[in-house]
Interface confidence: low
């Protein structure tokens, strides 16, 4: 009778084992071991026992001891079970960003590992087990479906293998895959709201605002704002689930025409875009041309208004005839025209919008001087010793210099409060003088003596 020791072995892959083959008869004709494994016989006294060192055990094996005794031949097998942890434990690659509400399939692949009966594959979210299955097949594959939720954002999913050899008196061997960090996101189906001027004048700045609500996580949203090929640099402010990107846009003559304004919001692996057209236009203020800005009374003045070739102008509220970019007004300058404003209003249609520009010029009319009865009465009669203020106002542009003298020397104190005396009586010659000429007017002051009763 042949026996073997040990009859069952669980050993690490590549390990060695000492196997003893024995026979019950004292003088066996034959005693040995049959195995494809490298073996080395250890010398022992006696004939009925042999010890072999089996090395580099890579897989499960069943070496067989045999003996040939007088009563016949017999065999005995030992069962070598090799254990090893998997060579590869990994989650199938997935995009790191997943939209909320999507079914996400986690797939764990396990290559190698033995004994398979003791090998379990566990899918985890953090430390929470999602699925546990025995490893079957090569490679073994375990899958589970997860409905992506907002609170999964930043969660780590992993796959763990458990080679449980504790029932065999060994330990629990664990191998864990590299974690997959899930980034969840919500990008609404509505495109971003883009608020911008529909038309923008060359050499001016406009403000563009792009906003979107219902984003998660809003801080991860990327905003791209561009006008044509010009990337804008927005200032982004975030709310709980919204953002607002505000940018200044400057345009030059090179940008003139229709430009495309784009706001793209990128979150996760999705994007939403809004396009708008902005018309860049050039429209200088109209030109108001006076033949001369300063003229003498009675001069004929031409007021011209000229604007952009496609503009329509009105001069002092009256449209050009025929309607177009030029208007003209002709007048004879009167004192009433001094300080008169000539306003040219030009209107240009740009992309369906009416743009208005104004220019105003003021006409200065030189006239005078004037001294008339209303403002410089020719006769004053005042009681003696009363308080009076002689008034005489000369008119003209430029304002005339006024002097009122009696006998060429005695001045009348115009605009000053005086006590009326006899010397104030008499005829004064008031002379108003300016660059436009001079006028004179006689003013008589009568002084009434008090009556004594």
């Amino acid at each position: 009778q042949t026996s073997v020791s040990p009859s069952k072995v669980i050993l690490p892959r590549g390990g060695s084992v000492l196997v003893t083959c024995s026979t019950s008869c004292d003088q066996p004709k034959l005693l040995g071991i049959e195995t494809p494994l490298p073996k080395k016989e250890l010398l022992l006294p006696g004939n009925n026992r042999k010890v072999y060192e089996l090395s580099n055990v890579q897989e499960d094996s069943q070496p067989m001891c045999y003996s040939n005794c007088p009563d016949g031949q017999s065999t005995a097998k030992t069962f070598l079970t090799v254990y090893w942890t998997p060579e590869r434990v990994e989650l199938a690659p997935l995009p790191s960003w997943q939209p909320v509400g999507k079914n996400l399939t986690l797939r764990c692949q396990v290559e190698g590992g033995a004994p398979r009966a003791n090998l379990t594959v566990v899918l985890l979210r953090g430390e929470k087990e999602l699925k546990r299955e025995p490893a079957v097949g090569e490679p073994a594959e375990v899958t589970t479906t997860v409905l992506v939720r907002r609170d999964h954002h930043g969660a780590n999913f992993s796959c763990r293998t458990e080679l449980d050899l504790r029932p065999q008196g060994l330990e629990l061997f664990e191998n864990t895959s590299a974690p997959y960090q899930l980034q969840t996101f919500v990008l609404p189906a509505t495109p971003p709201q883009l608020v911008s001027p529909r038309v923008l004048e060359v050499d001016t700045q406009g403000t563009v605002v792009c906003s979107l609500d219902g984003l998660f996580p809003v801080s991860e949203a990327q905003v791209h704002l561009a006008l044509g090929d010009q990337r804008l640099n927005p200032t982004v402010t975030y709310g709980n689930d919204s953002f607002s990107a505000k940018a200044s846009v400057s345009v030059t003559a090179e940008d003139e025409g229709t430009q495309r304004l784009t706001c793209a919001v990128i979150l996760g692996n999705q994007s939403q875009e809004t396009l708008q057209t902005v018309t860049i236009y050039s429209f200088p203020a109209p030109n108001v041309i006076l033949t001369k800005p300063e003229v003498s009374e009675g001069t004929e003045v031409t007021v011209k208004c000229e604007a952009h070739p496609r503009a329509k102008v009105t001069l002092n509220g009256v449209p050009a005839q025929p309607l177009g970019p030029r208007a003209q007004l002709l007048l004879k300058a009167t004192p009433e025209d001094n300080g008169r404003s000539f306003s040219c209003s030009a209107t240009l249609e740009v992309a369906g919008q009416l743009i208005h520009k104004n220019q105003t010029r003021e006409l200065r009319v030189l006239y005078g001087p004037r001294l008339d009865e209303r403002d410089c009465p020719g006769n004053w009669t005042w009681p003696e010793n009363s308080q009076q203020t002689p008034m005489c106002q000369a008119w003209g542009n430029p304002l005339p210099e006024l002097k009122c003298l009696k006998d060429g020397t005695f001045p009348l104190p115009i605009g000053e409060s005086v006590t009326v005396t006899r010397d104030l009586e008499g005829t004064y010659l008031c002379r108003a003088r300016s660059t436009q000429g001079e006028v004179t007017r006689k003013v008589t002051v009568n002084v009434l003596s008090p009556r004594y009763e």
Epitope: G317, A320, Q328, L329, L331
Partner: nanobody, 123 residues
Framework: QVKLEESGGGLVQPGGSLRLSCAAS????????MGWYRQAPGKQRELVAR???????AYEDSVKGRFTISRDNAPNTVFLQMNGLKPEDTAVYYC?????????????????WGQGTQVTVSS
């Protein structure tokens, strides 16, 4: 309504003369510059001569010494006396005027054009 009416065009032999007239009518207060433009087939319209209110005249180089522009402010008429005509003077001649019309709130200037008169210089 302002109207400019040209007359005096026609067929003339090289070296010959023509006198074009243009009369302005309508609610005219006064007329600033008046002028003559011409357009030969397949070419751009070009200024021939222009005359201001006070009678200052300006001419296109090719017509200097041959053409004379004049005006009569009383009946609002402008004339173009064309002497020494050449085949290259063949064109439609248009009258142009900056006309001031009286409006309720002031006077307005408009640039008006006539319908054109054909001048053909050929032997």
């Amino acid at each position: 309504q302002v109207k400019l009416e040209e007359s005096g065009g026609g067929l003339v032999q090289p070296g010959g003369s023509l006198r074009l007239s243009c009369a302005a009518s309508g609610s005219i207060f006064s007329i600033n510059d008046m002028g003559w433009y011409r357009q030969a087939p397949g070419k751009q319209r070009e200024l021939v001569a222009r005359i201001t209110r006070d009678g200052s005249a300006a001419y296109e180089d090719s017509v200097k010494g041959r053409f004379t522009i004049s005006r009569d402010n009383a009946p609002n008429t402008v004339f173009l006396q064309m002497n020494g005509l050449k085949p290259e003077d063949t064109a439609v001649y248009y009258c142009n005027a900056e006309i001031i019309t009286t409006q309720t709130l002031g006077r307005m200037l408009g640039e008006y054009w006539g319908q054109g008169t054909q001048v053909t210089v050929s032997s």
